[in-house]
């Protein structure tokens, strides 16, 4: 269940995934899973002591059960 080292470049400037457009690449297990890509920009979470290591995007929960894993509440609404 282990995976090889993850490239830091993948965090700051993600390269294209090996997945088809309707899929997302799950970094925890390093394979493609079904996902919805509808999302809206959100600000950085309030109180974070440094920039979160990702672009602050809010995936929508319902789109075909989207990357369901990716549906989450973030603080700091506009």
């Amino acid at each position: 269940m282990r995976r090889g080292p993850r490239s830091l470049r993948g965090r700051d400037a993600p390269a294209p995934t090996p997945c088809v457009p309707a899929e997302c690449f799950d970094l925890l297990v390093r394979h493609c899973v079904a996902c919805g890509l509808l999302r809206t920009p959100r600000p950085k979470p309030a109180g974070a002591s440094s920039p979160a290591p990702r672009t602050a995007l809010q995936p929508q929960e319902s789109v075909g059960a989207g990357a369901g894993e990716a549906a989450l509440p973030l603080p700091g609404l506009l």
């Epitope: 269940m1 282990r2 995976r3 080292p5 993850r6 830091l8 993948g10 965090r11 993600p14 294209p16 995934t17 997945c19 899929e23 997302c24 690449f25 799950d26 970094l27 925890l28 297990v29 394979h31 899973v33 079904a34 996902c35 890509l37 999302r39 974070a48 002591s49 440094s50 920039p51 979160a52 290591p53 990702r54 672009t55 995007l57 995936p59 929960e61 319902s62 059960a65 989207g66 990357a67 369901g68 894993e69 990716a70 549906a71 989450l72």
Partner: antibody, heavy 126, light 107 residues
Framework: EVQLVQSGGGVVQPGRSLRLSCAAS????????MHWVRQAPGKCLEWVAV????????YYGDSVKGRFTISRDNSKNTLYLQMNSLRDEDTAVYYC???????????????????WGQGTTVTVSS | EIVLTQSPSSLSASVGDRVTITCRAS??????LNWYQQKPGKAPKLLIY???SLQSGVPSRFSGSGSGTDFTLTISSLQPEDFATYYC?????????FGCGTKVEIK
């Protein structure tokens, strides 16, 4: 209110089976991966298993592999842990928890467990 | 499996103190490090995710820093409700692993 309510714990003899349940409410259960984590008395937290939102993938900790099975019924908003061939060392408080992730482009990044059940005690003893 | 080593295992502090807890990973985990608070008889509560991002609803006196193998949780001014056990956890790879905790006690 986002909530996970657990049931199914109890006292069981070594070698026997038990099934734990975790009922979700207040969020779209079918859109989230779910975990089981356990904590033996006075011990560290130990990750047990994870299941994807659609049950397409399941992973287990080495100590339970081949004995425990994680499953879910999205129509009932319920997560399960079937525990077979129980051992004394399986005695612990078991927690269900929601997988917390961010979508970054087409990458899913895992950020831990953001909602936890109240815990249920499993005691394996003869 | 990635081993997380927390230090100290316990500490005594007073209300108002600045408290620092460290977590070291056995290999680089980038920023995939999360912190939890657990009180006796209760489930853990997520405080910090991605090493430094404050979870919604968590007081701003909690902060996290670090990347790679060395991480820190800081409580800027300890409050009575902060006396608890704190755990780090990596979400870089399966199996997920936790540190063994730091118990923050009243001096």
């Amino acid at each position: 209110e986002v909530q996970l309510v657990q049931s199914g714990g109890g006292v069981v003899q070594p070698g026997r089976s038990l099934r734990l349940s975790c009922a979700a409410s207040g969020f779209t259960f079918s859109s989230y991966g779910m975990h089981w984590v356990r904590q033996a008395p006075g011990k560290c937290l130990e990750w047990v298993a994870v299941i994807w939102y659609d049950a397409s993938n399941k992973y287990y900790g080495d100590s339970v592999k081949g004995r425990f099975t994680i499953s879910r019924d999205n129509s009932k908003n319920t997560l399960y842990l079937q525990m077979n061939s129980l051992r004394d060392e399986d005695t612990a408080v078991y927690y269900c928890a929601r997988r917390f992730t961010h979508l970054r482009g087409q990458y899913i990044e895992d950020y831990g467990l953001d909602v936890w059940g109240q815990g249920t005690t499993v005691t394996v003893s003869s | 499996e990635i081993v997380l080593t927390q230090s100290p295992s316990s500490l005594s502090a007073s209300v108002g103190d600045r408290v620092t807890i460290t977590c070291r990973a056995s290999q680089s985990i980038s920023s995939y490090l999360n912190w939890y608070q657990q009180k006796p008889g209760k489930a853990p509560k997520l405080l910090i995710y991605a090493a430094s991002s404050l979870q919604s609803g968590v007081p701003s006196r909690f902060s996290g820093s670090g990347s790679g193998t060395d991480f820190t949780l800081t409580i800027s001014s300890l409050q009575p409700e902060d006396f608890a056990t704190y755990y780090c956890q990596q979400s870089y790879s399966i199996p997920l692993t936790f540190g063994c905790g730091t118990k923050v006690e009243i001096k």
